[in-house]
């Protein structure tokens, strides 16, 4: 009498996450009598997989009708393959008995799960920071297996390459996950600046998965201050400028203070965008010379995206003869201009 | 499946512009690649386009081909420019397999092209 | 460009003996490479994918293994429609790129 033989033909089979995986076994005698049984691994650990004559398998299926006379074909269909899923599985003949008893097993097909890695999600810094200060953005994918992967970082189309990345975990697993850390130094020129995160893997077709941030919700761009003086009208009436320019983002608050009191306080808003943009505002103080008796020190403070203030301060001189500066220019009247930032 | 066409007899330094129609399936889904095989010689990859249309060459390519496609046609072209004696051979279309672009699993019969004067 | 390095050039075995063809990479190339089938004027026909999984409809005489730069294709028992020129081919994850080995011709001894 020939020996029993179970034959699992295939060696490896590789299917899709979400597509149905066929695992084929024959066997080469109806004797002796006894079940077949599917295993995922080998040794005491193992798993069951199929038993047609007891559990419950949702997700397996016989592909010929195991019940059928002479019935020699005792391959498994498993659906809704997941990473999960990968291993090597094994078909089992037992021998009828009480138990039944493990007579031979066919040489196992290793099931491989090729999984598509998640779109990647770009992170950037909790706080905004300024030009020439480093910042870093990360990038996250998982899921996906085998494990080779590439993620390329990208500022406005250039490469990056202070990066780290790692592959977890080292060792073998049903599906891996990627983690990069790009730095990039701001300039002020980032305001439209985009990071992107681009992973290439087997599973896509040619085309890898880009997960993007805008350098616009990392930056600040501090804000320049400069007070000036026009030409003091004919009823003694001196307008002063303070101009914010090149600042972002738009969250600006600019107080008018007269000698070290408040007079005015404005808030920016739906300003113009620069073509880098960044944003300026310009607001007016009209003072009027002849209701005071001594020199007017005007501030101009100016508090950006919550941090703390700028001030630029500017003298306007108040002559004996008011009536005489009205020809006076700003640069006449600059004599103890402060143009400090405190 | 996958068929060429466009083959032909060219001189030396002319151009050929080779066209693969493709059927049962979506270009919008695959990529889709030029190999081609010297007459008694082995298979040469030339060029893939992604699913997207994202082009890729062979370093020997040196920008004397491009490939392109038109998905609502099911088309794919490999325009051949400055060809040469040594470009001559069969080309295949070829599609790669669903489960990842590490193998060709559709071919097409080929077609020939010869380069001389 | 990655080399991919096929031998021997041609073999000769006799009908229902086992058939040898290795592959070797000029770098690691993991898992991904696939073999071919070439018969005269015909076509490639792809064998296997990713050094050792059968494509559908192959007989189950054809085996593929290894991985990193070294590989095999094994016919465990050589039939008369087995002649014909075997080519290996590589797909490098990093650049993308594809390479073919010089390929092997099988003959019947």
């Known amino acids: 009498e020939e020996e029993l033989q179970v034959i699992q033909p295939e060696k490896s089979v590789s299917v899709a996450a979400g597509d149905s995986a066929t695992l084929n076994c024959t066997v080469s005698s109806l004797i002796p009598v006894g079940p077949i049984q599917w295993f995922r691994g080998a040794g005491p650990g193992r798993e069951l997989i199929y038993n047609l004559k007891e559990g419950h398998f949702p997700r397996v299926t016989p592909v010929s009708d195991p019940t059928k006379r002479n019935n020699m074909d005792f391959s498994i269909r498993i659906s809704n393959i997941t990473p999960a899923d990968a291993g090597t599985y094994y078909c089992v003949k037992f021998r009828k008995g009480s138990p039944d008893v493990e007579l031979k097993s066919g040489a196992g097909t290793e099931l491989s799960v090729r999984a598509k890695p998640s779109a990647p999600v770009v992170s950037g810094p909790a706080v905004r920071a300024t030009a020439e200060h480093t910042v870093s953005f990360t990038c996250e994918s998982h899921g996906f297996s085998p494990r080779d992967i590439t993620l390329k970082w990208f500022k406005n189309g250039n490469e990056l390459s202070d990066v780290q990345t790692n592959v977890d975990p080292a060792g073998k697993s049903v599906s891996y996950s990627i983690r990069s850390t790009a730095r990039v130094v701001l300039t002020r020129r980032d305001v439209h600046s985009q990071v992107i995160c681009e992973v290439a893997h087997v599973t896509l077709q040619g085309d890898p998965l880009r997960g993007t941030a805008n350098l616009s919700e990392a930056i600040r761009v501090p804000p320049f201050l400069e007070v000036t003086q026009q030409s003091m009208r004919a009823d003694n009436q001196v307008n002063v400028t303070c101009q914010v320019t090149k600042f972002y983002p738009q969250r600006l608050q600019l107080t008018w203070l007269e000698n070290g009191n408040v007079s005015r306080t404005e808030m920016a808003s739906a300003l113009p965008e620069n073509k880098d943009g960044t944003y300026n505002w310009t607001s007016w103080l009209l003072v009027n010379v002849s209701a005071h008796r001594d020199d007017v020190k005007l501030t101009c403070q100016v508090e950006h995206d919550g941090q703390p203030a700028v001030n630029k301060s500017f003298s306007v001189k108040v002559s004996a003869h008011p009536k005489e500066q009205g020809s006076n220019t700003a640069a006449e009247n600059t004599g103890t201009n402060e143009r400090n930032i405190y | 499946k996958v068929e060429e066409s466009g083959g032909g007899l060219v001189q030396p330094g002319g151009s050929l512009r080779l066209s693969c129609a493709a059927s049962?399936?979506?270009?919008?889904?695959?990529?889709m690649g030029w190999v081609r095989q010297a007459p008694g010689k082995g298979l040469e990859w030339v060029s893939i386009i992604s699913s997207s249309g994202s082009p890729y060459y062979a370093s020997w390519v040196n920008g004397r081909f491009t490939i392109s496609k038109d998905n609502s046609e099911g088309m794919v072209y490999l325009q051949m420019n400055s060809l040469r004696a040594e470009d001559t051979a069969v080309y295949y279309c070829?599609?790669?397999?669903?489960?990842?672009?590490?193998?060709?699993?559709?071919w097409g019969q080929g077609t020939t092209v010869t380069v001389s004067s | 460009d990655i080399v991919m390095t096929q031998s021997p050039d041609s073999l000769a075995v006799s009908l229902g003996e086992r058939a040898t063809i290795n592959c070797q990479a000029g770098?690691?190339?993991?898992?991904?490479l696939a073999w071919y089938q070439q018969k005269p004027g015909q076509p490639p026909k792809l064998l296997i994918y990713y050094a050792s999984t059968l494509e559908s409809g192959v007989p189950d005489r054809f085996s593929g293994s290894g991985s990193g730069t070294d590989f095999t294709l094994t016919i465990s028992s050589l039939q008369a429609e087995d002649v014909a020129v075997y080519y290996c081919?590589?797909?490098?994850?990093?650049?993308?790129?594809?390479?073919f080995g010089g390929g092997t011709k099988l003959e019947i001894k």
């Open positions: 770098q690691s190339i993991n898992s991904y």
């Open positions: 081919q590589s797909w490098h994850y990093i650049s993308r790129s594809y390479a």
């Open positions: 049962g399936f979506s270009l919008s889904s695959y990529v």
């Open positions: 070829a599609r790669v397999g669903p489960l990842g672009v590490d193998y060709f699993n559709i």
